[in-house]
């Protein structure tokens, strides 16, 4: 969480951003909130990116003003226009690319004053893992697959029964480059699994952490997946 204050003495407003991560090839949200104003026409929102000459996005007098927008963001950005009046200056970013990573500034002007806050935006690829029993294998084997990750993550297996056990000797992980030559498919196989146990496949890089759980009993198989973005701390 980053909170910024205006720099014009008593005419300052609080602007708050949250560091976030974008999944390449999908929509991203750059979060920013501010002290609301009662008149939409008095609010100006400017998004800037460090190292980029033009603006990322500008919204003023109740509508988008894109005359100064940088070419790399053309047709890829929008604010939530109906939420600006309540203090939401968050930016929607289309088709997130690796090159969108960097430091962004959310700069706000209202009738109460000015304020800004920076936001660190990371980009990569992350996806939910799915764990299945591999019936093709000669022994009881689990297969954990996740379709898109970047940068290359680490994969760790854990089990409820054997807590703290190191499964690196009885697992094998491979990374297969996807067709676009950026992201990779993660496949990890765990051998010699026992019945009536819950196993977890944990995939993690510096952007996200995902877990796929599987509980295997004699009568049923239960699965659960979870993904969490690893937001960087305030600077």
């Amino acid at each position: 969480l980053i909170i910024g204050f205006g720099i014009s003495g008593r005419h300052s407003i609080t602007v708050t951003t949250v560091a976030s991560a974008g999944n390449i090839g999908e929509d991203g949200i750059l979060s920013c909130t501010f002290e609301p104003d009662i008149k939409l026409s008095d609010i100006v929102i400017q998004w800037l990116k460090e190292g980029v000459l033009g603006l990322v996005h500008e919204f003023k007098e109740g509508k988008d003003e894109l005359s100064e927008q940088d070419e790399m963001f053309r047709g890829r950005t929008a604010v939530f226009a109906d939420q600006v009046i309540v203090g939401n200056a968050s930016l929607r970013l289309k088709n997130v690319q690796l090159t969108d990573a960097g430091t962004y500034k959310c700069y706000i002007i209202t009738s109460k004053g000015k304020g800004n806050a920076n936001l660190e935006y990371k980009t990569g690829a992350f996806s939910m893992p799915e764990v299945n029993v591999d019936y093709n294998a000669s022994s009881e084997t689990l297969r954990c697959e996740a379709p898109r990750w970047f940068p290359q993550p680490t994969v760790v297996w854990a089990s409820q029964v054997d807590q703290g056990a190191n499964f690196s000797e009885v697992s094998n992980t491979s990374f297969e480059l996807n067709s676009e030559n950026v992201t990779m498919k993660v496949v990890s196989v765990l051998y010699n699994v026992t019945i009536n146990n819950t196993y977890s496949c944990m995939i993690e890089n510096d952007i996200a952490k995902a877990t796929g759980d599987i509980k295997v009993t004699e009568s049923e198989i239960k699965r659960r997946s979870h993904l969490q973005l690893l937001n960087s701390k305030a600077s």
Epitope: G25, E26, D27, H57, K63, D64, E65, L66, S67, Q69, R74, G75, R76, T77, A78, A81, R92, K94, N95, R148, N178, S179, E180, T183
Partner: antibody
Framework: EVQLVQSGAEVKKPGASVKVSCKAS????????IGWVRQAPGQGLEWIGD????????NYNEKFKGRATLTADTSTSTAYLELSSLRSEDTAVYYC??????????????WGQGTLVTVSS | DIQMTQSPSSLSASVGDRVTITCKAS??????VAWYQQKPGKAPKLLIY???TLQPGVPSRFSGSGSGRDYTLTISSLQPEDFATYYC?????????FGQGTKVEIK
């Protein structure tokens, strides 16, 4: 309600130009991209290009670059497609469509009724 | 430029059938694939966008899925009003591109 109303059918000779209009209502014209798509008789849809009326920014299908010109008149909320050096294979129904997502170029969510352009000597 | 290869080009089906239409992108990956329905003499109608999001007012028998280069439109139980031509659209890149279309006919 979003509405896009296009100009009437046109018959043109090879080598001539045609200008098709698309009048928008029911939303803020300057805040959404407008795309143009054509469909030759019995054929599929072909994307021509799009324009952001709030700034006049355009994108064109390489196939139509230099021959298609997209413009917008914000005072009348009207978008225009002009196609020059017409040939018989340009005979098609030309559609305008609003792109969803405001300044963000989304999918085409609202369409005009289409304008038939016939190129014949 | 990204090309969208749609298949099949036509199919015959009966009311109640499950119908699947696929589109394959020539390169890249993103979720920006939309599906349209078009009936003779009419403008196309948006059914699905962002791979799987149903446009308001579109019946839930229509669904979209896919990732990477492969995308699918499924009609779970074909209704008489669904006989039409369907197109996919790739709108993630600067240049948009339609698939060639799939005509769904009555068997």
């Amino acid at each position: 309600e979003v509405q896009l109303v296009q100009s009437g059918a046109e018959v043109k000779k090879p080598g001539a130009s045609v200008k098709v209009s698309c009048k928008a209502s029911g939303y803020t014209f300057t805040s959404y991209w407008i795309g143009w798509v054509r469909q030759a008789p019995g054929q599929g849809l072909e994307w021509i290009g799009d324009i952001y009326p709030g700034g006049g920014y355009t994108n064109y299908n390489e196939k139509f670059k230099g021959r298609a010109t997209l413009t917008a008149d914000t005072s009348t909320s009207t978008a225009y497609l002009e196609l020059s050096s017409l040939r018989s294979e340009d005979t098609a129904v030309y559609y305008c469509a609003r792109l969803d997502g405001s300044s963000y170029r989304g999918a085409m969510d609202s369409w005009g009724q289409g304008t038939l352009v016939t190129v014949s000597s | 430029d990204i090309q969208m290869t749609q298949s099949p080009s036509s199919l015959s089906a009966s009311v109640g059938d499950r119908v699947t239409i696929t589109c394959k992108a020539s390169q890249g990956f993103n979720k920006y694939v939309a599906w349209y329905q078009q009936k003779p003499g009419k403008a196309p109608k948006l059914l699905i966008y962002y791979t799987s999001t149903l446009q308001p007012g579109v019946p839930s028998r229509f669904s979209g899925s896919g990732s990477g280069r492969d995308y699918t439109l499924t009609i779970s139980s074909l209704q008489p009003e669904d006989f039409a031509t369907y197109y996919c659209l790739q709108y993630g890149n600067l240049l948009y591109a339609f698939g060639q279309g799939t005509k769904v006919e009555i068997k």
